[in-house]
Interface confidence: low
């Protein structure tokens, strides 16, 4: 987790001077409670925007948003604490809006907004705004929290962003996959324009089960530039087990930007149609 | 936390081999892939291959195919990168990194071991 870029970060708006801090995440009210503190936030709001850096590369960020209440709590709200927790590695990272002059209710609803937090493809996270000074230990909540869930890079628009680039989002391979005679499998699919070699994973399952029955990998050296964006066809020697029938293609690509976490495309091959077999019919016919 | 510690630096004559350790900790060790990663002087970074320290299973770039070999000993939580046949152009830092096979990012590196090659 990172805020894009460390350029000057603004909070301020018409009526309010704010400046923009980092955070530990431990606001010293939580230490020093005070005796009055402001009501929640109102309205958050997540979504997903897409913001440059200065170097030019486009990562996918939060867009957080949220309004006060129109309540006397105002006049003791001191700022607010911004915390973004990645939930499968529990990483947070926290910035603090530190309200320099003392907020009046105006004609308009106050709305903020902030929209620095880099977060990743494939990732959900739970953003929470804090209205400060944090409540004492048993005073109401002034907090409000949502999960986000940024799209992976399959996402029209997340495809073009940095992160997903540099894990080979634009590489289409367009793999298909054939059975052929005597237990094989044909695996065509088209190369990128590196000189990276690639992996092909195969699994296989019986129809209807999770659990795999064959495993197999078979390694493709780095093509010569002539080679690029051809297509490479393999074919796949399967174990001849009984009923081990349903196979995934997984085509893993080194490109050097991702090394070995490109994103990998599969495809997979279904068991064959079972006819439908007749109910016997029985040769009596029971007396009841 | 999670913890990638590596051995300490090592100077070499040109032929020799040498061999970098890597300690993990903080993490199931066999739950996430190990790569091998090398940074010379002012060149980018360099990736060597990669192990699979569940099965042993390793992948080489190309360009190392013949010189290095990966391992690891499971009980330790350790995995190893072996480079033979040095020659001065292989004077770098040598990386271990985590990285999932399904994450976009490696996300946790070691400190890094300068190997020095010179006669």
């Known amino acids: 987790l990172r805020l894009l870029d460390h350029r000057a970060l603004v909070c301020s708006q018409p009526g309010l001077n704010c400046t923009v801090k980092n955070s530990t995440c431990l606001d010293d009210s939580w230490i020093h409670p005070r005796n009055l503190t402001p009501s929640s936030p109102k309205d958050l709001q997540i979504q997903l925007h897409f913001a440059h850096t200065q170097q030019g590369d486009l990562f996918p960020v939060a867009h957080i948003e949220w309004t006060l209440q129109t309540d006397a709590s105002i006049l003791y709200l001191e700022g607010a604490e911004l915390s973004v927790l990645q939930l499968n590695t529990n990483e947070r990272l926290c910035v603090r809006f530190e309200f320099l002059s003392k907020l009046r209710h105006h004609h308009r609803r106050w709305r903020f907004t902030f929209s620095h937090f880099v977060v990743d493809p494939d990732q959900e996270y739970e953003v929470t705004v804090h209205h400060l000074p944090k409540p004492i230990p048993d005073g109401d909540p002034n907090h409000q929290s949502k999960n986000f869930l940024v799209p992976d890079c399959e996402h029209a628009r997340m495809k073009v962003t940095t992160p997903c680039m540099s894990s080979g989002s634009l590489w289409d391979p367009n793999i298909t996959v054939e059975t052929l005679e005597a237990h094989q499998l044909r695996v065509s699919f088209t190369l990128w324009n590196e000189s990276t070699h690639y992996q092909i994973l195969l699994t296989s399952f019986p129809h209807m089960e999770n659990h795999s029955c064959f495993e197999h990998m078979h390694h493709i050296p780095a093509p010569r530039p002539e080679e690029f964006h051809q297509r490479s066809n393999v074919t796949l020697t399967l174990r001849n087990l009984k009923g081990c029938c349903r196979h995934q293609v997984q085509i893993q690509p080194f490109f050097s930007s991702c090394l070995n976490d490109c994103l990998r495309h599969s495809a997979t091959v279904s068991c064959p149609e079972m006819p439908d077999t007749p109910e016997p019919i029985p040769d009596y016919m029971p007396l009841w | 936390q999670v913890q990638l510690v590596q051995s300490g630096a090592e100077v070499k004559k040109p032929g020799a081999s040498v061999k970098v350790s890597c300690k993990a900790s903080?993490?199931?060790?066999?739950?996430?892939?190990i790569n091998w990663v090398r940074q010379a002087t002012g060149q980018s970074l360099e990736w060597m291959g990669w192990?699979?320290?569940?099965?042993?299973?390793?992948v080489y770039a190309q360009k190392f195919q013949d010189r290095v070999t990966m391992t690891r000993n499971i009980s330790i939580s350790t995995a190893y990168m072996e480079l033979s046949s040095l020659r001065s152009e292989d004077t770098a830092v040598y990386f271990c990194?985590?990285?999932?096979?399904?994450?976009?990012?490696?996300?946790?590196w070691g400190q890094g071991t300068l190997v020095t090659v010179s006669s």
């Open positions: 990194a985590r990285g999932r096979r399904d994450d976009w990012k490696n996300n946790y």
């Open positions: 903080g993490y199931t060790f066999t739950s996430y892939d």
């Open positions: 192990m699979n320290p569940k099965s042993g299973y390793t």
